[in-house]
Interface confidence: low
């Protein structure tokens, strides 16, 4: 199997950002859990959330109320999360790490860009 994600996710300031992470597995493979972290170089990594196949979503205190699962229906191989109300400080690199059975662990990175729309008066 392999992880499918986007190299770059672009959202407008204030929008919800979908951080995609989908495990394209062979028949019978399962995703046990998905861990999301922010991994900007030089900043150290910061936990976002842990998505467990049995126990659901646990959000790190730093992101309480800001990380959710996409609305149903949900594919059990989909480890994507929503980052609510994106701000400029959210711009950076994110990593999902996926634990699968029986194939082992996989990881993928993406960059989140947050666009600020300036209003020009004529």
């Amino acid at each position: 199997g392999e992880l499918e994600t986007s190299d770059v996710v672009t959202v407008v300031l204030g929008q919800d950002a979908k951080l995609p992470c989908f495990y394209r597995g062979d028949s019978g493979e399962q995703v046990g859990q998905v861990a999301w972290a922010r991994v900007d170089a030089g900043e150290g990594a910061q936990e976002l959330a842990l998505l467990h196949s049995k126990y659901g979503l646990h959000v790190s205190p730093a992101y309480e109320g800001r990380v959710e699962q996409p609305p149903p229906p949900r594919n059990p191989l989909d480890g994507s999360v929503l980052l609510r109300n994106a701000v400029q400080a959210d711009e950076g690199e994110y990593e999902c790490r996926v634990s699968t059975f029986p194939a082992g662990s996989f990881q993928a990175r993406l960059r989140l860009r947050v666009l600020v729309h300036h209003h020009h008066h004529h």
């Epitope: 861990a35 910061q46 936990e47 634990s99 059975f101 029986p102 082992g104 662990s105």
Partner: antibody, heavy 127, light 107 residues
Framework: EVQLVQSGAEVKKPGSSVKVSCKAS????????ISWVRQAPGQGLEWMGG????????NYAQKFQGRVTITADKSTSTAYMELSSLRSEDTAVYYC????????????????????WGQGTLVTVSS | DIQMTQSPSTLSASVGDRVTITCRAS??????LAWYQQKPGKAPKLLIY???SLQSGVPSRFSGSGSGTDFTLTISSLQPEDFATYYC?????????FGGGTKVEIK
């Protein structure tokens, strides 16, 4: 560095219960899975069950189902293992062990690898 | 339950020797395998996780390999402090199970 400190040795009568505690310090208690592993004198290691504090749900080995209860108190960063209906063959050293779901640097470990261990609690069952 | 079978159960070796311990799972466990070292009266210590990843602080003379059902722990040059009992453990499914242990003793 995570430290796990267990309660002291116990001597119990057959048929009674024992409750062993395991207090964690130096890490984020909610981020790891706590398991209990026992070792009878001169024998190997045997997993009894575990709990994930952030989810509050315990998972037990079938062998101990109905006789063991594992709980965790997030407010005090303490895990507990209670074993009932004790018999002589339960005489063993009982260890708590912690494995991260994700560690403080965000680098993910498959849970139930035991990065950290308590010092062990000897439980002797004797009439 | 997944059975973990270690061999040999006892191994006599000298300082400087290359030592290999094997662990076989009764069914495929991908790379969900750890190795521990235990000394008398002490708690086990994690050496290797995910079959081949060296735990932080563990000397590089320890290495792990394998996937599926067959796994190996190698000590490239045995040191005096390495005389101990070694256990493998699978974390593929619960109940988590350990091998019976391999005692590495002085020849």
């Amino acid at each position: 560095e995570v430290q796990l400190v267990q309660s002291g040795a116990e001597v119990k009568k057959p048929g009674s219960s024992v409750k062993v505690s395991c207090k964690a310090s130096g890490g984020t208690f909610s981020s790891y899975a706590i398991s209990w592993v026992r070792q009878a004198p001169g024998q190997g290691l045997e997993w009894m069950g575990g709990i994930i504090p952030i989810f509050g749900t315990a998972n037990y080995a079938q062998k101990f189902q109905g006789r063991v209860t594992i709980t965790a108190d997030k407010s005090t960063s303490t895990a507990y293992m209670e074993l009932s209906s004790l018999r002589s063959e339960d005489t063993a050293v009982y260890y708590c062990a912690a494995g991260y779901y994700y560690d403080s640097s965000g680098y993910y470990h498959q849970p139930y690898y035991f990065d950290y261990w308590g010092q062990g609690t000897l439980v002797t069952v004797s009439s | 339950d997944i059975q973990m079978t270690q061999s040999p159960s006892t191994l006599s070796a000298s300082v400087g020797d290359r030592v290999t311990i094997t662990c076989r799972a009764s069914q495929g466990i991908s790379n969900y395998l750890a190795w521990y070292q235990q000394k008398p009266g002490k708690a086990p210590k994690l050496l290797i996780y995910a079959a081949s990843s060296l735990q932080s602080g563990v000397p590089s003379r320890f290495s792990g390999s394998g996937s599926g059902t067959d796994f190996t722990l190698t000590i490239s040059s045995l040191q005096p402090e390495d005389f101990a009992t070694y256990y493998c453990q699978q974390s593929y499914s619960t109940p988590l199970t350990f091998g019976g242990g391999t005692k590495v003793e002085i020849k």
